[in-house]
Interface confidence: low
């Protein structure tokens, strides 16, 4: 089933994770999963879950072999999920396979997750 | 199938604790966020929180004020949510919720009452 | 926090109405809402995601649309399973919030 929220089978929900309570006044950044390697086929869907949250909301970026993701229409694409944000790429071809990267930042830490998809 | 089954109804007196439980079967509960969200009588939903399972990290909502724990038991595929210091304003139906809020448990009554 | 507020909060309807529910949020969550249905005594269903995307198992006269901070949730032709409170939640910021509700009743 294809949802927003989760790993592999599911998605996740956003980026943008801020907690006020007066225990979480402080800025912090938490990687909640290292990033899952996946193995599929020719023509088949790819999702790669960031799974981060931060305060101040960190932003997200992707990675493919060191050069930022480039989105495609209607088959590359990534958008922030309740718990960071997935990259999803469609109508698999051998040159998708790689090294992925998320980079988060909140504006003073940065942390990532690398996954690999072959 | 996908199922997230719930403890049973509790009333409970002002300043107590309760601890709700919701059992998941069907998939893997390690990898998938759990949220509880609860409904006063004729209330909008309210978010309280998540567990990731797989490792054990909360989030939740500071309007609760460190009144809410959320904990897991994965051997039994078992999270559970405990409310304390209660009050009247928490009578609610608490419902567990699997991370993409695409399956939900049956909910659980909480009465609050002296 | 989000404050999310929904319009109308109630109103009645025909089985066969276009029926549009309006969610507003008090800064901009992109298009992270998702839309649920919940009958009287029975759990939220999830109706739409990410603002726009069908969940699974849902008809196809429900639609929605919008970003940033105005939202619709569509039906096409309401019918007589339809009538319940419909509910938005933003899942852009913590703590996660949900509207008030639009109750849609039979007139």
């Known amino acids: 089933q294809e949802t927003e929220l989760s790993v592999s089978a599911e998605l996740v929900p956003t980026s943008s994770w801020n907690i006020s309570s007066e225990l979480n006044k402080d800025s912090y950044l938490t990687l909640d999963e290292p990033m899952n390697n996946i193995t599929t086929s020719l023509g088949q869907t790819a999702e790669l879950h960031c799974k981060v949250s931060g305060n101040p909301p960190p932003t997200i970026r992707w990675f493919k072999n060191d050069a930022p993701v480039v989105q495609e229409p209607r088959r590359l694409s990534f958008r922030s999920t309740i718990y960071g944000s997935r990259l999803r790429i469609r109508n698999l071809d051998t040159t998708d396979t790689g090294y992925f990267q998320c980079v988060a930042t909140n504006g003073k830490e940065v942390v990532s997750s690398t996954g690999v998809l072959f | 199938q996908v199922q997230l089954v719930q403890s049973g109804a509790e009333v409970k007196k002002p300043g107590a604790s309760v601890k709700v439980s919701c059992k998941a079967s069907?998939?893997?509960?390690?990898?998938?966020?759990m949220h509880w969200v609860r409904q006063a009588p004729g209330q909008r939903l309210e978010w309280m929180g998540w567990i990731y399972p797989g490792n054990g990290n909360t989030k939740f909502n500071h309007k609760f004020d460190g009144r809410v724990t959320i904990t897991r038991d994965t051997s039994a595929s078992t999270a559970y949510m405990e409310l304390s210091s209660l009050r009247s304003e928490d009578t609610a139906v608490y419902y567990c919720?699997?991370?993409?809020?695409?399956?939900w448990g049956q909910g659980t009554l909480v009465t609050v009452s002296s | 926090d989000i404050q999310m507020t929904q319009s109308p909060s109630a109103m009645s309807a025909s089985v066969g109405d276009r029926v549009t529910i309006t969610c507003q949020a008090s800064q901009d969550i992109g298009n992270n809402l998702i839309w649920f249905q919940q009958k009287p005594g029975k759990v939220p269903k999830r109706l739409i995601y990410f603002a726009t995307s069908l969940a699974n198992g849902v008809p196809s006269r429900f639609s929605g649309s919008g970003s940033g901070t105005e939202f619709t949730l569509t039906i096409s032709s309401l019918q007589p399973e339809d009538f319940a409170t419909y509910y938005c939640?933003?899942?852009?910021?913590?703590?996660?919030?949900f509207g008030p509700g639009t109750k849609v009743d039979i007139k």
């Open positions: 939640l933003q899942y852009r910021e913590y703590p996660l919030t």
């Open positions: 919720a699997r991370s993409d809020f695409d399956y």
């Open positions: 069907g998939y893997t509960l390690t990898t998938n966020y």
